[in-house]
Interface confidence: low
């Protein structure tokens, strides 16, 4: 049989941040290779990462076509001797289907993790500070342009700003569903800032990790009376 002595993949895991999406699995192959297939619920299966000895497959190009679709994926274990003929077929010498394992369904818009945000700049004018969060580019395209995180998520995405006086540890918070905050500060005081991306409507993967801390008096800031 063409499928003898193959081991089905296991521990299939989606790793996705800001829509960069990789499917990982185990085990490392011995006398076998893998091919991955992906489809939408209503679409045809498309093969990716043909006859690979890797235990991961980058599926970003497929899922960014429609991040609100639900995707199904499966990993086929193919005997080594049937993978050397250069034909992009998944079937063994007698035409039977090799063993495969299904990944859990993946909905990019719901499941991709939010990457660590970056504070782009902050500007103080008197007792107000405008803090701007970098609108990170994703790999999602529209009209040959890469969309930003805000373009994709719109108002579903908010940012939480944590800010505190450099001289104390008491943190205050503000929220925005644009990429800017306007906060009141005490004149003559230096403040530090950190932001976090949040999608409040989600039940899992709601929050990113905190951005690196930026403090007034550093080069990202600007001060005007």
């Amino acid at each position: 049989s063409g499928t003898t002595n193959t081991v089905a993949a296991y521990n299939l895991t989606w790793k996705s941040t800001n829509f960069k999406t990789i499917l990982e699995w185990e085990p490392k192959p011995v006398n076998q290779v893998y091919t991955v297939q992906i489809s939408t619920k209503s679409g045809d299966w498309k093969s990716k990462c043909f006859y690979t000895t890797d235990t991961e497959c980058d599926l970003t190009d497929e899922i960014v076509k429609d991040v609100k679709q639900t995707y199904l994926a499966r990993v086929f274990s193919v005997p080594w001797r049937n993978s050397t003929h250069g034909k992009e077929t998944l079937f063994g010498t007698h035409g039977e289907e090799p063993p495969f394992t299904n990944a859990r369904k993946f909905l990019p818009y719901r499941d991709t993790k939010l990457g660590q945000p970056t504070i782009q700049s902050f500007e103080q004018v008197g007792t107000k500070v405008n803090v701007t969060v970098e609108d990170e580019r994703t790999l999602v395209r529209r009209n040959n342009t890469f969309l930003s995180l805000r373009d994709v998520f719109g108002k579903d995405l908010i940012y939480t700003l944590y800010y505190w006086k450099s001289s104390s540890s008491g943190k205050k918070t503000a929220k925005t569903n644009t990429n800017e905050f306007l906060i009141d500060v005490d004149k003559g005081e230096n403040y530090c800032f950190s932001v976090q991306a949040v999608i409040p409507s989600r039940t899992v993967n709601r929050k990113s990790t905190d951005s690196p801390v930026e403090c007034m008096g550093q080069e990202k800031g600007e001060f005007r009376e």
Partner: antibody, heavy 125, light 108 residues
Framework: QVQLQESGPGLVKPSQTLSLTCTVS?????????WSWIRQHPGKGLEWIGE???????RYNPSLKSRVTISVDTSKNQFSLKLSSVTAADTAVYYC??????????????????WGKGTTVTVSS | EIVLTQSPGTLSLSPGERATLSCRAS???????LAWYQQKPGQAPRLLIY???TRQTGIPDRFSGSGSGTDFTLTISRLEPEDFAVYYC?????????FGGGTKVEIK
């Protein structure tokens, strides 16, 4: 102070496409707000049509989604509504509005604080 | 979609009286997303209250909002002649954003 002004034909024939433009003055359309279209049928309540962010990201009312396109032209400080295959049921006053300001006192809020005066569109042959 | 039901449909009161307008949602609405608008004939709606209870800049303090979950209330403590109009509640948290059917406050 931001002001909005709707413009477009007041009479559209059935099956044609209704096209309206909202011009933003006194502020930049790219300042981080969302921009909405709302309509009001004669003697009736308000119906939200959809909204756009200056980057072009849109959300539509599912009941109209198949017929609606909202677009933005940041160079002209305008956003537009197109509603295809209109019928008499699309006769209404159409308003554009700003969704703002999104953050206040550590909370985030959604509401429409600036509205255009409205423009009446009649669908009739 | 979230359906907002306003009651009563019409409220007939005299100047100086208190008006209590109700807005009930078909499912829970985060109060951050609940707003009230006033509309007079031939005019666009005007924002009165956002976040269920925060008055918009320039709105007199006789207007107040309260409530959470599925039940929200707009109160006009003492009606002035210019307050006779139609009032709408709106939720802007879940697409499609929806408005209530309106309550008309008319002079008795």
């Amino acid at each position: 102070q931001v002001q909005l002004q709707e413009s477009g034909p007041g009479l559209v024939k059935p099956s044609q496409t209704l096209s309206l433009t909202c011009t933003v003055s006194g502020g930049s359309i790219s300042s981080g707000q969302y921009w909405s279209w709302i309509r009001q049928h004669p003697g009736k309540g308000l119906e939200w049509i959809g909204e756009i962010y200056y980057s072009g990201s849109t959300r539509y009312n599912p009941s109209l989604k198949s017929r609606v396109t909202i677009s933005v032209d940041t160079s002209k400080n305008q956003f537009s509504l197109k509603l295809s295959s209109v019928t008499a049921a699309d006769t209404a006053v159409y308003y554009c509005a700003r969704d703002a300001p999104y953050y206040y006192g550590g909370g985030y809020y959604y509401y429409m604080d600036v509205w255009g005066k409205g423009t009446t569109v009649t669908v009739s042959s | 979609e979230i359906v907002l039901t306003q009651s009563p449909g019409t409220l007939s009161l005299s100047p100086g009286e208190r008006a209590t307008l109700s807005c009930r949602a078909s499912e829970s609405v985060d109060s951050s997303y609940l707003a009230w608008y006033q509309q007079k004939p031939g005019q666009a709606p005007r924002l009165l209250i956002y976040g269920a209870s925060t008055r918009q800049t320039g709105i007199p303090d006789r207007f107040s909002g309260s409530g959470s979950g599925t039940d929200f209330t707009l109160t006009i403590s003492r009606l002035e002649p210019e307050d006779f109009a139609v009032y709408y509640c709106q939720q802007a948290g879940v697409v499609p954003y929806t408005f209530g059917g309106g309550t008309k406050v008319e002079i008795k």
